[in-house]
Amino acid sequence: VPRWRQQWSGPGTTKRFPETVLARCVKYTEIHPEMRHVDCQSVWDAFKGAFISKHPCNITEEDYQPLMKLGTQTVPCNKILLWSRIKDLAHQFTQVQRDMFTLEDTLLGYLADDLTWCGEFNTSKINYQSCPDWRKDCSNNPVSVFWKTVSRRFAEAACDVVHVMLNGSRSKIFDKNSTFGSVEVHNLQPEKVQTLEAWVIHGGREDSRDLCQDPTIKELESIISKRNIQFSCKNIYRPDKFLQCVKNPEDSSCTSEI
């Protein structure tokens, strides 16, 4: 008789999830010499231990602590790029500007990027059918708690000048409910972080508005200033040209505004 299984509103665990995590770990540790000491089997065991046999609406940051410990990594704290709703461009940027890092350029972020996972209470099975949706089901699900945990730690580690890439095409350029708005902003450390600089990425070809004057950016400035951190904002009118100029800063067209 097939066991009754809880139906959640979100997609199920990404197929071949264990193999994917293990393979990503091996690849990452091969590419990054400073992480060669990491035992990927132990990493997978710690990852699995965070959610297997646990109710997928009752996951805590504590559950991920063994994984956090194994994935401890030092990135230059003054080279951190945060992002909100514009992941692809942020990743394209750090692929070119190799001395800057998004969360997904760290081991833990790289392992989990674009993946979904959850288990079931009291069974060692991974649920490939459905997983809790943050809005419709519960916020303390394995995926949300993971990103909240790693995002908090990443923001806490940041220092000096921190950059954040924001999507100027969205109705809320700064969204208080995003991971950046709800977690990272509040975990930047005053005095340790001197300045948060927002890069507002324009979508439209002919969009010459100053999106740094957008009410949601003013809201971000207010939150940041109340935390005793300086705030700066720049419009990136031409993201394609911006990336090109990061690749070839000597290009004569790169002196003008991008």
Epitope: N78, C159, D160, V161, Q189, E191, K192, V193, Q194, T195, E197, S225, K226, N228, Q230, S232, K234
Partner: antibody
Framework: QVQLVESGGGLVQPGGSLRLSCAAS????????MHWVRQAPGKGLEWVSN????????YYADSVKGRFTISRDNSKNTLYLQMNSLRAEDTAVYYC???????????????WGQGTLVTVSS | DIQMTQSPSSLSASVGDRVTITCRAS??????LNWYQQKPGKAPKLLIY???NLQSGVPSRFSGSGSGTDFTLTISSLQPEDFATYYC?????????FGQGTKVEIK
């Protein structure tokens, strides 16, 4: 009123050590980040180091990294700079300064001590 | 680190003259630029913060302007007490840096 008084300067041989102190009064010391800034004779101002209000975070100029250590004792309202492996080029007047932050000002060094002279020579 | 370049390194002027000092940052520092005045044997004194804001007690003949990488300090009518060395300072980064200074001397 705000007062910062440096002490501990003097003549020291190359390779030697010295510990500077900065006694703060007239403000709630534990609420402010602090800086050390130096000025070689006849030269400009060079930032050396700063420390977070609670002492949990420090920055150093590349020229002193690994040799100088900034610290503070909030119970004594005192800032310190431990200087090891001193070189002739460390000869300067060392100032402590308060890091003031407000939304209107952003980050400034608003109050400075009168400085203490460190001479590194054999 | 961000380099700050001041010019000129020294200038001679008379009382009543209009004096302009420029400061250039090696990268965009937004509006996080402060100016200090230092007299011989004394500690520096904050004059202007965030490009153009006068610190309390500073006379209105001092003014600042600029943004991004290029900044200017202007003394509209030089007074005897203004003969001193002036420094720009970037506070965009936690590793604050100063310009090399501009010495304003009596002609």
């Amino acid at each position: 009123q705000v007062q910062l008084v440096e002490s501990g300067g003097g003549l020291v041989q190359p390779g030697g050590s010295l510990r500077l102190s900065c006694a703060a009064s007239g403000f709630t010391f534990s609420n402010y980040g602090m800086h050390w800034v130096r000025q070689a004779p006849g030269k400009g101002l060079e930032w050396v180091s700063n420390i977070r209000s609670d002492g949990s975070w420090t920055y150093y100029a590349d020229s002193v990294k690994g040799r100088f250590t900034i610290s503070r004792d909030n119970s004594k309202n005192t800032l310190y700079l431990q200087m090891n492996s001193l070189r002739a080029e460390d000869t300067a007047v060392y100032y402590c300064a308060r890091r003031y932050w407000s939304k209107s000002h952003a980050s400034v060094t608003d109050y400075w001590g009168q400085g203490t002279l460190v001479t590194v020579s054999s | 680190d961000i380099q700050m370049t001041q010019s000129p390194s020294s200038l001679s002027a008379s009382v009543g003259d209009r004096v302009t000092i420029t400061c250039r940052a090696s990268q965009d520092i937004s509006a996080f630029l402060n100016w200090y005045q230092q007299k011989p044997g004394k500690a520096p004194k904050l004059l202007i913060y965030k490009v153009s804001n006068l610190q309390s007690g500073v006379p209105s003949r001092f003014s600042g302007s600029g943004s991004g990488t290029d900044f200017t300090l202007t003394i509209s009518s030089l007074q005897p007490e203004d003969f001193a060395t002036y420094y720009c300072q970037q506070a965009y980064s936690g590793s604050i840096t100063f310009g090399q200074g501009t010495k304003v001397e009596i002609k």
